[in-house]
Interface confidence: medium
């Protein structure tokens, strides 16, 4: 009687269980009952990551340079090639099939965590005492500069963009 | 709010070339990817190209290539595409479409060209 | 290249019908993203990253699938969803689209 169901990388066919092609090989023809299932390997550039009985392999994936990507793997005949971000690009999604370039923390803003090649920098407002005066993918906020400390006075205040203007304390009259 | 403002409606004559713009508000136009999308009779949709805004650097459908030229004007946050040598076959709308999310996120209100004599 | 192929071509449905439509790929893909298109207006990014809403979409519109097959769904059409969906791959250049679908409104 004719099998319902095939063994584990198997597969049913004619009333008959062939044997799957192994990962990097594509199926050419199925087997008989008298002859084994034949598979032939997959081109360069070309993958399959499962036992299967494809007549085609998968092509693998294009890290495109004009989309910020950069090989981070080469693909093999079992695995697919996987892009990253050149650096200073940072994937549009997790499918990172796209970069875009870091967003800089402009003046006002600092830094609170540097970019990666999966997420974008994160700039937070510099707070009252704290200045940043331009654009930048790793600067903090700074403090402003302490007068006092060193026995000046203030002649400008502080902003979130510029830092205290310190000068030489007047004389008493 | 992100818009792509696309120059107006073309009719040319076979065998001239021409130039269309989409110009980016809103948003830098550098640091994204421009793409050039051909819609004809209103139905298929054929990825022509792309530009890396920030490096220039294009990547072209091989069907488009030496019909197709991309530039971009950093300064006036403009993204150009030139077609050439036009042929009745080359009448469809023009889309440019700014990928943000992976996806094209960011289309134009797309270029109607019409090659007649 | 990589041919998406969009089915059915057209269809029909009435408001509070689940619809699906689907995209094969003629080749394995990470990602599917799709695109509604009304009659004479840019398309809009509709679902991107297979399954990802774009901003404004509306819940009841789903995305799923993985290699060859992907598929769009609407839980509960209604009239505004009218339009032409077509689906992209960002995998291989050139960079293709589907034929897409058409749907309409009772």
């Known amino acids: 009687e004719p099998p319902t169901a095939c063994r584990e990388k198997q597969y049913l066919i004619n009333s008959q269980c062939c044997s799957l092609c192994q990962p990097g090989q594509k199926l050419v023809s199925d087997c008989t009952e008298f002859t084994e299932t034949e598979c032939l390997p997959c081109g360069e550039s070309e993958f399959l990551d499962t036992w299967n009985r494809e007549t085609h392999c998968h092509q693998h994936k294009y890290c495109d340079p004009n989309l910020g990507l950069r090989v981070q793997q080469k693909g093999t005949s079992e695995t697919d090639t996987i892009c990253t971000c050149e650096e200073g690009w940072h994937c549009t999604s997790e499918a990172c099939e796209s970069c875009v370039l870091h967003t800089p923390c402009i003046p006002g803003f600092g830094v609170m965590e540097m970019a990666t090649e999966t997420t974008d920098t994160v700039c937070h407002p510099c707070p009252v005492g704290f200045f940043s005066n331009q654009s930048s993918l790793f600067e903090k906020c700074y403090p402003w500069t302490s007068c006092e400390d060193k026995n000046l006075e203030v002649l400008q205040k502080g902003t979130s963009q510029t830092n205290v203007i310190c000068g030489l304390k007047s004389r008493m009259r | 709010e992100v818009q792509l403002q696309q120059s107006g409606p073309e009719l040319v004559k076979p065998g001239a070339s021409m130039k269309i713009s989409c110009k980016a508000s809103?948003?830098?136009?550098?640091?994204?990817?421009m793409n050039w999308v051909k819609q004809s009779h209103g139905k298929n949709l054929e990825w022509i190209g792309l530009?890396?805004?920030?490096?220039?650097?294009?990547t072209y459908n091989q069907k488009f290539k030496g019909k197709a030229t991309l530039t971009v004007d950093k300064s006036s946050s403009t993204a150009y595409m030139e077609l050439l040598s036009l042929t009745s076959e080359d009448s469809a709308v023009y889309y440019c479409?700014?990928?943000?999310?992976?996806?094209?996120?960011?289309w134009g209100q797309g270029t109607s060209v019409t090659v007649s004599s | 290249q990589i041919v998406l192929t969009q089915s059915p071509a057209i269809m029909s449905s009435s408001p509070g019908e689940k619809v699906t439509m689907t995209c094969s790929a003629s080749s394995s893909v990470s990602y599917i993203h799709w695109y509604q298109q009304k009659s004479g207006t840019s398309p809009k990014r509709w679902i991107y990253?297979?399954?990802k809403l774009a901003s404004g979409v509306p819940a009841r519109f789903s995305g799923s699938g993985s290699g060859t097959s992907y598929s769009l769904t609407i839980n509960s059409v209604e009239a505004e969803d009218a339009a032409t969906y077509y689906c992209q791959q960002w995998r291989t250049n050139p960079y293709t689209f589907g034929g897409g679908t058409k749907l309409e409104i009772k």
């Open positions: 809103g948003y830098s136009i550098t640091g994204y990817t």
């Open positions: 530009i890396n805004t920030y490096t220039g650097g294009t």
């Open positions: 479409a700014g990928t943000g999310t992976g996806a094209m996120d960011y």
């Open positions: 990253d297979t399954s």
